[in-house]
């Protein structure tokens, strides 16, 4: 596919990435799908600088990011290595809490109202952040 050289209209550019911040709420899987349909992915936070950037643009409300452990280990949706990467969990999180009564534990990560991360039930309808990188090949087929 062709390389994306500029951000989609009305997205916010920062450090060669483009960001869109939802104001409605969706379950994690629906938010993930929404971003994919925009040729993007749920935000992957790779540094303290990016953490602060996102935090400054979102409201002080629970907001999904592209991090989950639905298949066992924690994974970023774009393949960024979790173990060696940036983390900003709240104290004693993630805890895979089962006491919510909704069945299962907590497999999806979100920004809390103070920006730090928590794991929660993936079905909760939270806001989300989409991210797409500039200079990466888009998923669109090339024009013939």
């Amino acid at each position: 596919g062709s390389e994306r050289t500029c951000c989609p209209v009305n997205w916010v550019e920062h450090e060669r990435s483009c960001y869109w911040f939802s104001r409605s709420g969706k379950a994690w899987a629906d938010a993930d799908n929404y971003c994919r349909l925009e040729d993007a992915h749920l935000v992957v936070v790779t540094s303290w600088e990016e953490q602060k950037f996102v935090q400054h643009h979102i409201g002080p409300v629970n907001t999904w990011m592209g991090l989950h452990d639905q298949n066992g280990p924690w994974k970023w949706v774009d393949g960024t290595d979790y173990e060696t990467g940036f983390k900003n969990w709240r104290p004693e999180q993630p805890d895979d809490w089962y006491g919510h009564g909704l069945g299962g534990g907590e497999d999806c990560a979100h920004f809390t109202d103070d920006g730090r991360w928590n794991d929660d039930v993936c079905q909760r309808p939270y806001r989300w952040v989409c991210e797409t990188e500039l200079d990466k090949a888009s998923q669109e087929p090339p024009l013939l």
Epitope: V9, N10, W11, V12, Y19, W20, F21, S22, R23, S24, Q55, H56, H57, I58, G59, P60, V61, D114, G115
Partner: antibody, heavy 124, light 112 residues
Framework: QVQVQQWGAGLLKPSETLSLTCAVY????????WSWIRQPPGKGLEWIGE???????NYNPSLKSRVTISVDTSKNQFSLKLSSVTAADTAVYYC??????????????????WGQGTTVTVSS | DIVMTQSPLSLPVTPGEPASISCRSS???????????LDWYLQKPGRSPQLLIY???NRASGVPERFSGSGSGTDFTLKISRVEAEDVGVYYC?????????FGGGTKVEIK
Amino acid sequence: QVQVQQWGAGLLKPSETLSLTCAVYGGSFTDYYWSWIRQPPGKGLEWIGEINHSGDTNYNPSLKSRVTISVDTSKNQFSLKLSSVTAADTAVYYCAREFPYSGSYLYYYGMDVWGQGTTVTVSS
Amino acid sequence: DIVMTQSPLSLPVTPGEPASISCRSSQSLLHSNGHNYLDWYLQKPGRSPQLLIYLGSNRASGVPERFSGSGSGTDFTLKISRVEAEDVGVYYCMQPLQTPFTFGGGTKVEIK
């Protein structure tokens, strides 16, 4: 200069559905979220909900079960439907421009464009 | 929901004199980005509301310099340095920090 014009039925009977439309002229409809706000006679302002051109909505929980906000991007219009109205829904209804489409809090500049208001009366 | 409380309810003013309206929120409106998410609107008699101040202290386009907003966290103030006859109406504060957006009950400014 961006302008918004709104219209809809002004007199309803209890249990009917309120229906209003707001049209945006002279500015980029797709650049913003758009809100509905209402004001009962002699009272203050109440936010009803918001929508963007993609159809993403956010509703006031106090009205959520009865409210639908929809969009027609081809006409630069968005609409409000409120079902099962009662006398308590009698109010002036306004549409207004608000957050940028990006959703970014850093680019919020207030509700800076308002419609002229539509008076809706619910009476049997 | 965030509760917004305005005072006074009514404010009789003399043209040329200053006026001040208070607004308090039930929780802090200060965002980690440094902005206070508090707007001020004026609704003149028979008209739609109009934006005066956004993000606590920023005057909207075309708003006279006699209007100023201040405050942080939960306590905010709208000041009119010298009231003019055209300033009469109901003033509302509003928080856009969290949905649902919520408004104060309004302060009616009238000429003595």
